[in-house]
């Protein structure tokens, strides 16, 4: 696992403990909370990051209208169960034996139940819509410049293959980034769109997961882009199953 050899740290995940105890004295890093070894040459899975976080102290419009099945992460933080690959287990339960099913980004997609609740498979989130509102600037951003900058960001900072950034929409002051990645499209070694979106969200909140970095401050053609608010919508390959009671 690639880690900075000189001082043995994990460039892509500051929520790790690293030591030169790998094969041949190589630097090896383990995620806080789970103790699982992580690959520091790529992003760490959201499940392991959430676990580490819980263990740590502390019309003719170009904009997309999220579908009726889009999920927003309203439940917030919880201590997840992760599988040996670091993915979310389909069923999550809390200490009081309340259980629910989650999608591949760990967002609840069913009503809460008890220990008898079954979650047959981990449903993949194949479409993520990141909705940003920016603060007033010297002028509207040029759409193509903005598009290029955000695509560059996801490619260089989050190592997400460009084909998974489906579109960047802009209607001042709203910016929308669409990420799409079907199960069939995701090859071994590809960064998951859910992980890239989570790293981006934490960056915007000034809580960068990268070693030795603060938040992410974007600029487009020199112009500072100051984000006012962020909303993230998640669309699953199979629509979520909530009772009508929740929908009203």
């Amino acid at each position: 696992h690639t880690a900075a050899q000189d001082n043995c740290t994990c460039p892509t995940n500051k929520m790790t403990v690293c030591s030169p105890d790998g094969p041949g004295g190589r630097c090896q890093c383990r995620a806080l909370g789970s103790g699982m070894a992580v690959d520091c040459s790529t992003l760490t899975s959201k499940c392991l990051l959430l676990k580490a976080r819980m263990s740590a102290p502390k019309n003719a419009r170009t904009l997309v209208r999220p579908s009726e099945h889009a999920l927003v992460d309203n439940d917030g933080l919880y201590d997840p169960d992760c599988d040996p690959e670091g993915r979310f287990k389909a069923r999550q339960c809390n200490q009081t034996s309340v259980c629910w099913c989650v999608n591949s980004v760990g967002v609840r997609r069913t009503d809460k139940g008890d220990l008898s609740l079954r979650c047959d498979e981990l449903v993949r989130t194949h479409h993520i819509l990141i909705d940003l509102r920016h603060r007033p600037t010297a002028g509207a951003f040029n759409h193509s410049d903005l598009d290029a900058e955000l695509r560059r960001l996801f490619r260089e900072r989050y190592r997400l293959h460009p084909k998974f950034v489906a579109a960047v929409h802009y209607e001042q002051p709203t910016i929308q980034i669409e990420l799409r990645q079907n199960t069939s499209q995701k090859a071994a070694g590809d960064v998951d769109i859910g992980d890239a979106a989570y790293y981006f969200e934490r960056d915007i909140k000034g809580e960068s997961l990268f070693q030795g970095r603060g938040g992410l401050d974007l600029r487009v053609r020199g112009e500072p882009l100051q984000v006012e608010r962020t909303l993230i919508y998640y669309l699953d390959e199979i629509p979520p199953k909530f009772s009508m009671k929740r929908l009203t």
């Epitope: 000034g206 960068s208 938040g215 600029r219 020199g222 500072p224 100051q226």
Partner: antibody
């Protein structure tokens, strides 16, 4: 290395205008905005606004709208700040500053230009 | 506008002392906080950005912490060259500075 060099001290009469220059070197001028910050004697630093030399777009602190005008000249890699209708309240040191390469904090500063308004 | 309130406004300390300066924002600034040092007749110098990231060449005795609305600058062992005025600045929503903290020799 990155440098911002400002014009010299000015003494002006009330009601007059003053134009301060900020010559940038050591980096691509159009890559970053230029901020202007003022500091009256014994007072806190006060952000006035910025200019984007890439497209001459400006953003001002509400307090300085109509009072200050920011311009730039790509050919000479120089930014300018003009303050009109000077009063004794405008006596201050005026700084230009460039943002940090990774954040919106201000990493490189000019040496400052003292503007004194006196009758 | 976001208001930044620094405290104390001044303090007297001796070489070797541990010094702490706090800065409170009127709303959450999501770690978009910088600390500057300014000496008389000089321009401010950036010490820390992103609330905690030390700038290149800044001695490790300087450190920043905090989140949300509350932030702290700590000088672990004050050196003669550290006597100066320190300002915090938020850059989450435009740019505003605290009123400054003057660190004087006791």
């Amino acid at each position: 290395q990155v440098q911002l060099v400002q014009s010299g001290a000015e003494v002006k009469k009330p009601g007059a205008s003053v134009k301060v220059s900020c010559k940038a070197s050591g980096y691509t001028f159009t890559t970053y905005v230029i901020h202007w910050v003022r500091q009256a004697p014994g007072q806190r630093l006060e952000w006035m606004g910025y200019i984007n030399p890439n497209n001459d777009g400006t953003k001002y602190n509400e307090k300085f709208k109509g009072k200050a005008t920011l311009t730039s000249d790509k050919s000479s890699t120089t930014a300018y700040m003009e303050v009109r209708g000077l009063t004794s309240e405008d006596s201050a040191v005026y700084y230009c500053a460039r943002p940090h390469f990774e954040t919106h904090a201000m990493d490189y500063w000019g040496q400052g230009t003292l503007v004194t308004v006196s009758s | 506008d976001i208001q930044m309130t620094q405290s104390p406004s001044s303090l007297s300390a001796s070489v070797g002392d541990r010094v702490t300066i706090t800065c409170k924002a009127s709303e959450d600034i999501f770690n978009r906080l910088a600390w500057y040092q300014q000496k008389p007749g000089k321009a401010p110098k950036l010490l820390i950005s992103g609330a905690t990231s030390l700038e290149t060449g800044v001695p490790s005795r300087f450190s920043g912490s905090g989140s949300g609305k509350d932030y702290t600058l700590t000088i672990s062992s004050l050196q003669p060259e550290d006597f100066a005025t320190y300002y915090c600045q938020q850059y989450w929503n435009t740019w505003t500075f605290g009123q400054g903290t003057k660190v004087e020799i006791k």
